[in-house]
Amino acid sequence: EEELQIIQPDKSVSVAAGESAILHCTITSLFPVGPIQWFRGAGPARVLIYNQRQGPFPRVTTVSETTKRENMDFSISISNITPADAGTYYCIKFRKGSPDTEFKSGAGTELSVRAKPS
């Protein structure tokens, strides 16, 4: 089976306050089985932004139908962006288990927030 890669094609995304930000993430293999999660930041202080198996996440919508078993696009849209949303976002694949364990991370996408146009 093909080794899983997590592709975050954008090093950075710049969005005006109040707009929506699309953060792209695709995977190249359906294995191992387990959910995708998005985090802002790295390490112990990272913040969960989206978990395929949990919810709801009111400001986050998935770009594709992630409930379909064959889906490999886990891009997300975050609405009503504020300066507090700035940071580096990581798309991370977890291996199913009790508990799920982190398997592989994308390279990250840095979200910067521009002032709202006046």
Partner: antibody, heavy 118, light 108 residues
């Protein structure tokens, strides 16, 4: 006019270090991801490293991972590349390149020559 | 890593002729492909991005086509200043970004 001016190249021995700089002018430096691309003598182009617009995300080619460090100082409109544990195969012209809205390079500097020789 | 294979390695043509350069990707890169021109002693110059869009200031004798894995750069009615080395580059899949090995267009 967009200008990218590299400096810091020179002749070093294997195992030594070097710091390359790229001074940017004529555009909003902090609005662009940046990369370093190198070209060995008589060879083709090889992407080396890239950095997001605020510096939160860095990417490296496997050939330099763990040996080179890309960074930027947006207050000085300057991009850097630290080269550690240099090898003879690192001998090349190192170009600083501005990334457009996608990861291709719309402006390049003239390059700085790094020669690694015993 | 996506490998880009350019062919031919060298193209010998006369001014006024048409040059057809090929770039083949080892995986689907959609339309995420750029072409650059490099003359001796100079930095590369962006010619084409997104497979077929001309960069600012590039004459319309340069055109790009293709998507997926097969791409073509066509230079119609070659001028003396067009004799150079041409590189393709794929992007959009995150690291590593890769270049083809280049095609040299030389005067016959």
């Amino acid at each position: 006019d967009v200008q990218l001016v590299e400096s810091g190249g020179g002749v070093v021995r294997p195992g030594e270090s070097l710091r390359l700089s790229c001074a940017a002018s004529g555009f909003a430096f902090s609005d662009h991801d940046m990369s370093w691309v190198r070209q060995g003598p008589g060879e083709g182009l090889e992407w080396v490293a890239g950095i997001s617009l605020r510096g939160g995300v860095t990417w490296y080619a496997d050939s330099v991972k763990g040996r080179f460090t890309i960074s930027r100082d947006n207050s000085k409109n300057t991009l850097y590349l630290r080269l550690f544990s240099l090898r003879t195969e690192d001998t090349a012209i190192y170009y600083c390149a501005r990334e457009s809205w996608n990861t291709f390079f719309d402006y390049w500097g003239l390059g700085t020559l790094v020669t690694v020789s015993s | 890593e996506i490998v880009l294979t350019q062919s031919p390695g060298t193209l010998s043509l006369s001014p006024g002729e048409t040059a057809t350069l090929s770039c083949r990707a080892s995986q689907n890169v959609r339309s995420n492909l750029a072409w650059y021109q490099q003359k001796p002693g100079q930095a590369p110059r962006l010619l084409i991005y997104d497979a077929s869009s001309r960069a600012t200031g590039i004459p319309d004798r340069f055109s790009g086509s293709g998507s997926g894995t097969d791409f073509t750069l066509t230079i119609s009615s070659l001028q003396s200043e067009d004799f150079a080395v041409y590189y393709c580059q794929q992007y959009g899949n995150g690291p590593p970004l890769t270049f083809g090995g280049g095609t040299k267009v030389e005067i016959k």
